[in-house]
Amino acid sequence: QQQTLPKPFIWAEPHFMVPKEKQVTICCQGNYGAVEYQLHFEGSLFAVDRPKPPERINKVQFYIPDMNSRMAGQYSCIYRVGELWSEPSNLLDLVVTEMYDTPTLSVHPGPEVISGEKVTFYCRLDTATSMFLLLKEGRSSHVQRGYGKVQAEFPLGPVTTAHRGTYRCFGSYNNHAWSFPSEPVKLLVTGDIENTSLAPEDPTFPADTWGTYLLTTETGLQKDHALWDHTAQNLLR
């Protein structure tokens, strides 16, 4: 006899990286027939929702109107059908951004390199942080962590045309509180014609559309909540 129901999916809309004072909705999708959903934050009960017809009962939304550092952290949800509870969802790491200062991102030897050259990004922030994050814009949201007192190095090694794209960095005050994003650095990798034509390239965005990027980078993933979960987890672990 089944003792628990399958775990629900959890995700954040429009994104799990939320600028401070902006709104975010945490979504929890369970099964039809669910009569109660519970959202847990850092292991404690945070909110309860009990949908009734004609509300769709397989998915609920928990709205956070004003994101701040106290709301940032790890969320999970569970649901109940009759007396039977589900397994808990995967953990959703909700990150508050635009905290305190703005780091500076630079690249060595420069933003235009030849395929095979060694490239290193440097992220610098003169305030109290020791962890830095480098993100390549685009649907895949590639993330690297780096450490240093005021600056972190991100060696990419010998680059290929697949490394082309726009990069930004954050200073991280803790796992769930990040600085403003740096100004973008666009890395242009030139190679022979055959390599260039076949190389994948993430979409890039102008410097003033970081907000748009946050809204759009995961849109393809929102249709696949398992992949969304996986991406969110890997970003912070």
Epitope: P54, E55, N58
Partner: antibody
Framework: QVQLQESGPGLVKPSQTLSLTCTVS?????????WNWIRQPPGKGLEWIGY???????NYNPSLKNRVTISRDTSKNQFSLKLSSVTAADTAVYYC??????????WGQGTLVTVSS | DIQMTQSPSSLSASVGDRVTITCKAS??????LSWFQQKPGKAPKSLIY???RLVDGVPSRFSGSGSGTDYTLTISSLQPEDFATYYC?????????FGGGTKLEIK
Amino acid sequence: QVQLQESGPGLVKPSQTLSLTCTVSGYSITSDDYWNWIRQPPGKGLEWIGYISYEGSNNYNPSLKNRVTISRDTSKNQFSLKLSSVTAADTAVYYCARLGYPAMDAWGQGTLVTVSS
Amino acid sequence: DIQMTQSPSSLSASVGDRVTITCKASQDINSYLSWFQQKPGKAPKSLIYRANRLVDGVPSRFSGSGSGTDYTLTISSLQPEDFATYYCLQYDEFPWTFGGGTKLEIK
């Protein structure tokens, strides 16, 4: 885009059974949501009659005194209303409607059924 | 059955006005309340559910509030297309019951 269309006779004699069908296009009635019948007597307010859910379960308004049945034909993507022993008080515009918040609802255009001999 | 009493039954207002319609339930309905708009000769359309949540695609000038037995629909700045009749619906208990309606007319 989901569309609903009511069909059935516009005139029913007292004591007979009113039968209406709602044909749904653009959305499967078994995939989600609640498929309702709602009526509105001329110049008056709305009254909920009942629904059949995506899974086939029913809820009815008991004020209709067990005169109401809502069923479905999944092969035709239709759901139907039967209201027995009608009187003049059952004269109304009858709407079929899909409700499933937070999604925007969808309604038929409504069909006027007059109960008269 | 839960009785839903709407007020006022009719209301005159001008484009740009802020308008408030209220609905009172005969018992606590735990915020399981929706609001509908109906134009003459047309089917109703949902605006708000769970007392204060906007149905997908509904303009943000519509908002809902309230708890317990008392609920309010507010239109922050009336547009010409907002002149219609508004109904509340409780779905906390079966049978679902509508309020009697509020007719919003042009002043």
